[in-house]
Interface confidence: low
């Protein structure tokens, strides 16, 4: 699915980190770990120390939107999750610094953080129908729901 | 230096079950994710398992999916193979081989064992 | 699940000559792709991994290119051990697969 356009012209204004170091959980009680330099995976770990800790930026849209605009790091890094398109994997992308201000093709680096009590689900800004997803036998990446899973427990305080 | 031993082949008639490990040395077995793949006579590859380092993350071949399991024990650095309801189609050298270090992800296989002949029979 | 096609399925060739394999995945697999070489009654050998990187100790006459979907396998210049049988292998989905392997055999 292609972004939408109209979100093109749409600035986002980096605010602050919000989080530190919290672990991602799927519904399968699956921490999102690096397969390697480029991709994401999930896995059941028996020992949480192998899984990801990520940070969280928040970003002010220009156009006041009522969600919560984040950008995911991986913790004491400056590997940023990127969206490709549908169904496909997330990519981790090197930037020397967090960006100030966000606009057009670079909201694949943005996500709409929503929850639902207990459940997070991150959607792509670029691509407002997809979501941060695992999926079995594959890297962490863009979908759109089942059979990919959605939602994420976030685990803090885990060091 | 990196070692892996297969045993456990032999002839066996269709629909029965057969056991097969593979013996790891030379590096430390258990940050390693581990696969078998068997190749029947005269012909090519074919991945049939894998396992992840900590034995959480299992993978199957869908020839092989409901039929084979695939475990390790870390503590005696073996890996297993079992197979049950054999078919003649699973007649081949399994092989084991390691994969990448301390992550549950697809991998090029550097090193294999020397294979272990699997005839199904009746 | 990812199918691997190798081509061609033989190929004759004389020592010194330039060997060309070609392997095609049925979607796109980035640079997830590995070959290996196997002789008879031997367990096969990884030349190359990630498309285009030389395993530790395989000579440099060897080399991998490709992305995407399409990729090759080059022996620059034969040499009398480089007779064997070649496979692909796509390491992108956690469903390994093997391409279905060419013979390269002496002219």
């Known amino acids: 699915s292609a972004p939408f356009s109209f979100l093109s012209n749409v600035k986002y204004n980096f605010m602050r980190i919000i989080k530190y170091e919290f672990i991602l959980n799927d519904a399968l009680n699956q921490s999102i770990i690096r397969a390697n330099d480029q991709y994401l995976t999930a896995a059941a770990l028996h020992n949480l120390d192998e899984a990801v800790k990520f940070d969280m930026g928040a970003y002010k849209s220009s156009k006041d939107d009522a969600k919560i605009t984040v950008i995911l790091r991986i913790s004491k890094t400056q590997l940023y999750v990127t969206a490709q398109d549908e169904d496909q994997p997330v990519l981790l992308k090197e930037m020397p610094e967090i960006p100030k201000t966000i606009t057009g093709s670079e909201t694949n680096l943005l996500f709409f953080w929503e929850t639902h009590g207990t459940k997070n689900y991150f959607t792509s800004v670029a691509h407002p129908n997809l979501f941060i997803a695992t999926k079995q036998d594959y890297w962490v990446c863009l979908a759109g729901g089942p059979p990919s899973i959605t939602d994420f427990q976030i685990l803090e305080n885990q060091a | 230096q990196v070692q892996l031993v297969e045993s456990g082949g032999g002839v066996v008639q269709p629909g029965r079950s057969l056991r097969l490990s593979c013996t790891a040395s030379?590096?430390?077995?258990?940050?390693?994710?581990v696969h078998w793949v068997r190749q029947a006579p005269g012909k090519g590859l074919e991945w049939v398992a894998a396992?992840?380092?900590?034995?959480?993350?299992?993978y199957y071949a869908e020839s092989v999916k409901g039929r084979f399991t695939i475990s390790r024990d870390n503590s005696k650095n073996i890996l297993f193979l079992q197979m049950d309801s054999l078919r003649l189609e699973d007649t081949a050298v399994y092989y084991c081989?390691?994969?990448?270090?301390?992550?549950?992800?697809?991998?090029?296989?550097?090193?294999w064992g020397q294979g272990t002949l699997v005839t199904v029979s009746s | 699940d990812i199918q691997m096609t190798q081509s061609p399925s033989s190929v004759s060739a004389s020592v010194g000559d330039r060997v060309t394999i070609t392997c095609r995945a049925s979607?796109?697999?980035?640079?997830?792709l590995a070959w290996y070489q196997q002789k008879p009654g031997k367990a096969p050998k990884l030349l190359i991994y990630?498309?285009?990187n030389l395993e530790t100790g395989v000579p440099s006459r060897f080399s991998g290119s490709g992305s995407g979907s399409d990729f090759t396998l080059t022996i620059s210049s034969l040499q009398p051990e480089d007779f064997a049988t070649y496979y692909c292998?796509?390491?992108?989905?956690?469903?390994?697969?093997f391409g279905g392997g060419t013979k390269v055999e002496i002219k």
């Open positions: 081989a390691r994969g990448r270090p301390k992550v549950v992800i697809p991998a090029p296989l550097a090193h």
């Open positions: 030379g590096f430390t077995f258990s940050m390693f994710g």
């Open positions: 396992v992840s380092y900590d034995g959480s993350n299992k």
């Open positions: 979607q796109g697999i980035s640079s997830w």
């Open positions: 990630e498309a285009s």
């Open positions: 292998q796509q390491t992108s989905s956690f469903l390994l697969s």
